[in-house]
């Protein structure tokens, strides 16, 4: 493993590896207090990795512990040799007890795939360590899983192609090792926010990679380009999906998470964002009628501009369990927006607004909002995020998304916010006014808005209600209706994905 990370701030607990570093502290006390090695752990515990076949959705049921060379537990718990087999692999832990997401995932898999074998890989004794030690244990756990799979392959009708390893955080790299070490190729590995520290930039054999399974799909929900990234930033699968850019997840801000909580810490925000990958995957299992779609894009900024809502040439895919296998792609970065909770699905729209004249714009960018009116529902007032700046005599592209299915769009209200929202903007407005006292009226002209739905791939053009009135200024609004040439559906593939 690459040990080049000098500072490991994991779950907001800082641990300095540099020589002579002070005793590490986190928001809730000393790191070694939190991540103590349980006394007499390594000597007396045999084995350190346990495989629990969850035969029932009932959490009270003990399931069956599988061990290589012992066929009886397979019979006792009716292991189905021809069915899909899921191995769920947890990650590093600050506690000796399973995190709550595990029950949700097991339950969702049982609900969705009633005949499947669901195996929990319990490596808590090796994961409940200092993070660095847990990282060094991932290889060992990967070997254990590979040995289990090699033994199962000796059984009649068991196919490695039916195996789906699902690893969260450090568990995603464990899955990678297992896929690497097993004789043959496992069908699929899903990496749920694979861990970043000590894996970012590592060699492909020392982390999850597309070589580890026939299909490797990855959800990245806690990546950071500044500070230390809890989740890995680099793409490590055939498809790598970055919900909400892969960083700030809705519903996980300090205000959202802490709410009225008196003793909350930043740790809860980290947990919320890191664990969001699991909940997105659970959502894909239990809300298969509400699939979320991701769109291939070179980077998050381009996606935020609304440039990347195409489904041509497999450029879009369902996320989570329903993802369509794409072996021909490697490290394909895909993006989507989501809601703050289940069901996470949103409806994406690309809005192309051609600004054909632009008066007295001054220094500050205008703040625009749109409201979309559809046959099923009307949207809330949605901000148009200006990623760079408004260009005149050019087509400006924006991404907007709604939480509800609006149906077919009928009209659009475009609003230019009047009053400045900050002292900084007010100051810029004032300076702008002083520098152009004779031209106080800021104005721009828009004739039409072209809209493309990411989910249906339909394209529509909206024209101003009054062809003579195309100007908009601060505090004013402009209404657009479907142009007479109305629906202009291109022959683009709709993101309808056959469910596995």
């Amino acid at each position: 493993m690459s040990n080049s990370v000098p500072l490991l701030c994991f779950w907001s607990l800082c641990y300095c590896f540099a020589a002579g570093s002070p005793v590490p502290f986190g928001p809730e006390g000393r790191l070694e207090d939190k991540l103590h090695k349980p006394k007499a752990t390594q000597t007396e515990v045999k084995p350190s990795v346990r495989f629990n076949l969850r035969t029932s959705k009932d959490p009270e049921h003990e399931g069956c512990y599988l061990s290589v060379g012992h066929s009886q537990p397979l019979e006792d718990c009716s292991f189905n040799m021809t069915a899909k087999t899921f191995f769920i692999i947890h990650g590093w832990t600050m506690s000796g007890i399973f995190e709550n997401w595990l029950h949700k995932l097991v339950s969702a898999l049982h609900t969705r795939e009633k005949d499947a074998n669901v195996v929990v890989v319990d490596w808590l004794p090796l994961a409940h360590q200092l993070y660095t030690d847990a990282v060094n244990n991932t290889r060992v756990v990967g070997h254990s899983i590979a040995r289990m799979l090699d033994w199962l392959q000796e059984k009649d009708d068991f196919s490695l192609g039916n195996v789906h390893l699902i690893g969260y955080s450090l568990g995603a790299h464990v899955a990678g090792y297992a896929g690497n070490f097993v004789k043959g190729t496992v069908g699929r590995i899903t990496g749920l926010d694979p861990a970043g520290p000590m894996f970012e930039g590592a060699d492909i054999h020392k982390r999850l990679s597309p070589d580890d399974a026939d299909f490797v799909d990855v959800l990245h929900t806690y990546t950071r380009s500044f500070g230390l990234s809890i989740g890995i930033q680099m793409p490590v699968g055939h498809i790598d999906i970055y919900p909400n850019g892969g960083d700030f997840q809705p519903g996980c801000g300090l205000n959202d998470v802490l709410g009225s909580i008196a003793y909350g810490t930043i740790t809860e925000v980290v947990k919320c964002e890191h664990e969001r990958a699991v909940h997105l995957f659970v959502d894909s299992l239990v809300n298969q009628d509400k699939p979320s779609f991701a769109f291939q894009c070179t980077d998050s900024n381009r996606f935020k501009k609304g440039i990347c809502l195409s489904c041509r040439k497999n450029r879009c895919n369902s996320i989570g369990y329903n993802a369509k296998k794409m072996r021909n792609k490697r490290n394909s970065k895909m993006y989507l927006k989501t809601r703050a909770g289940m069901p996470f699905r949103v409806y994406h729209y690309q809005m192309k607004i051609h600004v054909f004249s632009y008066k007295n714009m001054g220094e500050i960018e205008p703040t625009f909002y749109v409201t979309l009116y559809g046959t099923n529902a009307d949207s809330q007032t949605l901000p148009l995020e200006i990623v760079e700046r408004i260009e005149q005599n050019a087509t400006n592209t924006f991404l907007v998304y709604t939480e509800e299915d609006l149906g077919d769009l009928l009209k659009i209200q475009l609003t230019w916010e009047g009053a400045s929202q900050s002292w900084y903007n007010l100051w810029k407005e004032f300076r702008s006014y002083l520098s152009q006292p004779r031209n106080p009226g800021r104005e721009l002209n828009i004739r039409r808005i072209r809209v493309k739905s990411g989910e249906t791939q339909r394209k529509l053009t909206f024209c101003t209600e009054d062809p003579e009135n195309t100007s908009i200024s601060p505090g004013r609004e402009l209404w657009f209706r479907k142009c007479r040439d109305g629906w202009r559906m291109k022959n683009e593939t709709s993101p309808t994905v056959e469910l596995p």
Epitope: H103, K104, L124
Partner: antibody, heavy 119, light 107 residues
């Protein structure tokens, strides 16, 4: 039949320590987490912490981190909770409870151990 | 910490009535909510786990519903043996927490 048998009532002076036991039977002790819950007189329940008997890994409520220590003896299928630096605030009924496989819900509870701290 | 609020401290009902007890979480806890009954000088007894899953040996008149932040324990046709304290508990995140309890008493 699953049973959790707790040690008897304790009357102790402030500053003392006590170790409450919880002997499990009727299931594989190392397969389920054991949790401890405090109930002050006429009040609600407070989760103190949990232990994974398989290897001794623990999780504590921050509030009780300096008050309680959870341990197990696998050979006798017994869980222990030691409470230190006792004050009158620690007077309560303490329960051990067996977690489900994930440690979330508690289907079996001990009968409770009454702790009275008084000078 | 996640705060569980059981808004009704006491609920007075007549045997044979149907009753609903509520539990509200300070943040989304999905379905990680469990209900317990406790009679005087007894240990708590699990009634419903994971919001709606029934427990063997618990009468079918007890049922649970809800997800996210709002949860309900329903007792269809209350019997005299049902009187006592009812607590909700969350296992979504540590520390696990309990509601303040609702006392179900005879009217």
């Amino acid at each position: 039949e699953v049973q959790l048998q707790q040690s008897g009532p304790e009357l102790l002076k402030p500053g003392a320590s006590v170790k409450i036991s919880c002997k499990a039977s009727g299931y594989t002790f190392t397969d389920y987490t054991m949790h401890w819950v405090k109930q002050s007189h006429g009040k609600s329940l407070e989760w103190i912490g949990g232990i994974n008997p398989y290897y001794g890994g623990t999780t504590y409520n921050e509030k009780f981190k300096d008050k309680a220590t959870l341990t197990v003896d696998k050979s006798s299928s017994t869980a222990y909770m030691e409470l230190r630096s006792l004050t009158s605030e620690d007077s309560a009924v303490y329960y051990c409870a067996k977690g489900d496989y994930y440690g979330g819900s508690y289907n079996y509870w001990g009968q409770g151990t009454t702790l009275t701290v008084s000078s | 910490d996640i705060v569980l609020t059981q808004s009704l401290a006491t609920l007075s009902v007549t045997p044979g009535d149907s009753v609903s007890l509520s539990c509200r979480a300070s943040q989304d806890i999905s379905n990680s909510l469990h209900w317990y009954q406790q009679k005087s000088h007894e240990s708590p007894r699990l009634l419903i786990k994971y919001a709606s899953q029934s427990i063997s040996g618990i009468p079918s008149r007890f049922s649970g519903s809800g997800s996210g932040t709002d949860f309900t324990l329903s007792i269809n046709s209350v019997e005299t043996e049902d009187f006592g304290m009812y607590f909700c508990q969350q296992s979504n995140s540590w520390p696990y927490t309990f509601g303040g309890g609702t006392k179900l008493e005879i009217k």
